[in-house]
Amino acid sequence: LIIGFGISGRHSITVTTVASAGNIGEDGILSCTFEPDIKLSDIVIQWLKEGVLGLVHEFKEGKDELSEQDEMFRGRTAVFADQVIVGNASLRLKNVQLTDAGTYKCYIITSKGKGNANLEYKTGAFSMPEVNVDYNASSETLRCEAPRWFPQPTVVWASQVDQGANFSEVSNTSFELNSENVTMKVVSVLYNVTINNTYSCMIENDIAKATGDIKVTESEIKRRSHLQLLNSKAS
């Protein structure tokens, strides 16, 4: 969490951003909030990016003002216009690309004063893993697949019964580059699994951590998966 205060003769206002991560090939949100003003026409929001000459986005007098917008952000940015009045200056970014990563500044002017805060935006790819029993294998084998990751993640297997066990000797992980030559498909195979046990396939990079669980019993197979973004620090 980054909390910024205004400088200058005018009063300062508190602006808060949250470091976040964008999944390439999806829309992303850069979070920013500020002390609200009662008049929308008095609020100015400017988003800037370090190393970029033009603005990322500008909203003033109750509407978008894009004449100074940098070419790389044309047609891709939006604020939540109906939420600006309550202090939401968050930016929506269409079709996140790797090159969108960097340091952004959320700069706010209201009738109460000015303020700004920086935000570190990471970009990469992350997806939910799916764990299945590999019936084609000679022994009881589990296969964990996740379609899109970047940067290359680590894959660790764990089990409920053998807590703390190291499965690196009985597992094999491969990374296959996807057609756009950036993201990769993750496939990890775990051998010699036992019945009536819950196994977890954990995939992690510096952006996200995802887990796929599978419980195999005589009568059924239960699956569960979840994904968590890392580094959501507020400023």
């Epitope: 090939g25 978008d64 044309r74 891709r76 940015t77 604020v79 109906d82 929506r92």
Partner: antibody, heavy 115, light 109 residues
Framework: EVQLVESGGGLIQPGGSLRLSCAAS????????MNWVRQAPGKGLEWVSV???????YYADSVKGRVTISRDNSKNTLYLQMNSLRAEDTAVYYC?????????WGQGTTVTVSS | EIVLTQSPGTLSLSPGERATLSCRAS???????LAWYQQKPGQAPRLLIY???SRATGIPDRFSGSGSGTDFTLTISRLEPEDFAVYYC??????????FGQGTKLEIK
């Protein structure tokens, strides 16, 4: 050259199924937001579906549950699987790439649903 | 659901005249996510304007876009014979993910 070419349209009976294809050249389908847009005879443009670069999909309410958008990255091709077809699905179907807007369109393929 | 309403439905003008086409949204639309397209009979649509006011590659400068919030305008400063077509505005980003206006037909007077 950046290009989209649709195929797979034709005359189909109500309740039938059809798979439309859209072959892309000059760019990678999986790096873009790819859409299907249709146009009924003498009518305006109607958005049907989108698949994001991530693989996430969205559909218009009018086709939800009857239509599936997908892609084959190795063939650089976009698909629209249409099931339970109705007379009101009769239209020219276009695929379109969305970068900052829908900047590349195919020539369209005609789907006629009639008994 | 955001509804885009275009007016007029049909606009009859002569070559050399100025055309002003309107697109009104039922709720606020980000300028970045508002585009204009031209479609001629038997052809696919062609992108003219994106981000409410940026001209797409190869589009003559007689075409310009403006507006914000709920009111957007496409202006053709001096009509050429090839400009007579149907024009659509389109928004991105809310449910449904994309919406088109019903179109304005620009015809020769």
């Amino acid at each position: 050259e950046v290009q989209l070419v649709e195929s797979g349209g034709g005359l189909i009976q109500p309740g039938g199924s059809l798979r439309l294809s859209c072959a892309a050249s000059g760019f990678t389908v999986s790096s873009n937001y790819m859409n299907w847009v249709r146009q009924a005879p003498g009518k305006g443009l109607e958005w049907v579906s989108v698949i994001y670069g991530s693989g996430r999909t969205y559909y218009a309410d009018s086709v939800k549950g009857r239509v599936t958008i997908s892609r084959d990255n190795s063939k650089n091709t976009l698909y629209l699987q249409m099931n339970s077809l109705r007379a009101e699905d009769t239209a020219v179907y276009y695929c379109a790439r969305d970068t900052y807007a829908m900047d590349v369109w195919g020539q369209g393929t005609t789907v006629t649903v009639s008994s | 659901e955001i509804v885009l309403t275009q007016s007029p439905g049909t606009l009859s003008l002569s070559p050399g005249e100025r055309a002003t086409l309107s697109c009104r949204a039922s709720q606020s639309v980000s300028s970045s996510y508002l585009a204009w397209y031209q479609q001629k009979p038997g052809q696919a649509p062609r992108l003219l304007i994106y981000g409410a006011s940026s001209r797409a590659t190869g589009i003559p400068d007689r075409f310009s876009g403006s507006g914000s919030g709920t009111d957007f305008t496409l202006t053709i400063s001096r009509l050429e014979p090839e400009d007579f077509a149907v024009y659509y505005c389109q928004q991105y980003g809310s449910s449904p993910m994309y919406t088109f206006g019903q179109g304005t037909k620009l015809e020769i007077k």
